[in-house]
Amino acid sequence: IPTEIPTSALVKETLALLSTHRTLLIANETLRIPVPVHKNHQLCTEEIFQGIGTLESQTVQGGTVERLFKNLSLIKKYIDGQKKKCGEERRRVNQFADYLQEFLGVMNTEWIIES
Amino acid sequence: IPTEIPTSALVKETLALLSTHRTLLIANETLRIPVPVHKNHQLCTEEIFQGIGTLESQTVQGGTVERLFKNLSLIKKYIDGQKKKCGEERRRVNQFADYLQEFLGVMNTEWIIES
């Protein structure tokens, strides 16, 4: 990722910039953007970044708001890299079974599952 | 989802079935399946279920192992439904900004980010 700061620091900085520029971002009162209904955020990264693209195209650029969108695009690069790592390594069934057990365990304990 | 039990109970039952049928599942020693390198599971649902499909096609069916794969296909249906809900609702920028802040906050605290 072409960034000099670690991804974790990048996310923190982006959160701060989002707060700073909130008023400017929400200025367009007619614009509508898809917002996921649930909180399983990782399932929705594609839609979230499409929404960011829509927002960027409608926001007056300049100053640190540009930095916000630059950061968001670096975060997208990081997530795309993580997605690539989902399917790159072909392992034995043994390891896949262990991973599947972990995945289901996480679904069981951490996912927000509607009844 | 065409299932009489809630998704959370379905996941628990599937975890138990996975343990029960482990020996049968790992019998194929030559089969290789993509295993994600990281633990951001929700980013990898597509690859995980492709792997499950590969495993199912190579596993002798019958008895409760069929129930395992049936359950996994119901879990996939649930996740596909969640994915659909990522982009169905078009909201104002205000709500999108709130969701983006939440997404970045979750990334900051809960995601497994490599340094």
Epitope: K85, Q95, D98, Y99, E102, G105 | P36, K39
Partner: antibody
């Protein structure tokens, strides 16, 4: 920086048990599997098993199954390896090692713990 | 279990020499092999993973190659600090297994 710090040397009698600890720091403990490897004096390396701190799931080398128990304490970011029914051939240096990713190479090793089994 | 056969078990070489160590797996392990260096009384240190990927901070004189069953570790120009024992490790299947080691000694 990322570190695995193991407990000190132990001397045990045959038939006893030993519990070796491995304290992780510098990273999120639940993100990486912890493997245990041993090395008898003048011998090579032997994999005992791994534990996934994310879900407490462990997997053992069949050779150690029933005698080795891998556990973690998430609150202190510590992994443990307990070996029971000790015999003289269990005299070895025991290492913990972190998986870089799921079922991946060992990117960080502990300094080792010498366990001596002697009557 | 997958057997890992390393050769030679020991070798004598001089500073500046090119050294090659081989490792043969009893079955196909794809490229899930790492090379580990251990100095006397010290903890092991991984040098190479996935057969040919050098770990950050490891000098470029170390290189790995191979896939399937046959693997090689090469030290292009041996340095004084390279005198140690080298192990291969397959992490393709459980139980993970190591080669018996190759001791690189000063000639």
């Amino acid at each position: 920086q990322v570190q695995l710090v193991q407990s000190g040397a132990e001397v045990k009698k045959p038939g006893a048990s030993v519990k070796v600890s491995c304290k992780a720091s510098g990273y999120t403990f639940t993100n990486h599997h912890i493997n245990w490897v041993r090395q008898a004096p003048g011998q090579g390396l032997e994999w005992i098993g791994y534990i996934n701190p994310y879900n407490d799931y462990s997997r053992y080398n069949q050779k150690f199954k029933g005698r080795a128990t891998l556990t973690v304490d998430k609150s202190t970011s510590t992994a443990y390896m307990e070996l029971s029914s000790l015999r003289s051939e269990d005299t070895a240096v025991y290492y913990c090692a972190r998986d870089y990713g799921n079922f991946w190479y060992f990117d960080v090793w502990g300094q080792g713990t010498l366990v001596t089994v002697s009557s | 279990d997958i057997q890992m056969t390393q050769s030679p078990s020991s070798l004598s070489a001089s500073v500046g020499d090119r050294v090659t160590i081989t490792c043969k797996a009893s079955q196909d392990i794809n490229s899930y092999l790492s090379w580990i260096q251990q100095k006397p009384g010290k903890a092991p240190k991984t040098l190479i993973h996935r057969a040919d990927r050098l770990i950050d901070g490891v000098p470029s004189r170390f290189s790995g190659s191979g896939s399937g069953q046959d693997f090689t570790l090469t030290i292009s120009s041996l340095q004084p600090e390279d005198f140690a024992t080298y192990y291969c490790l397959q992490y393709d299947d459980f139980p993970y297994t190591f080669g018996q080691g190759t001791k690189v000694e000063i000639k």
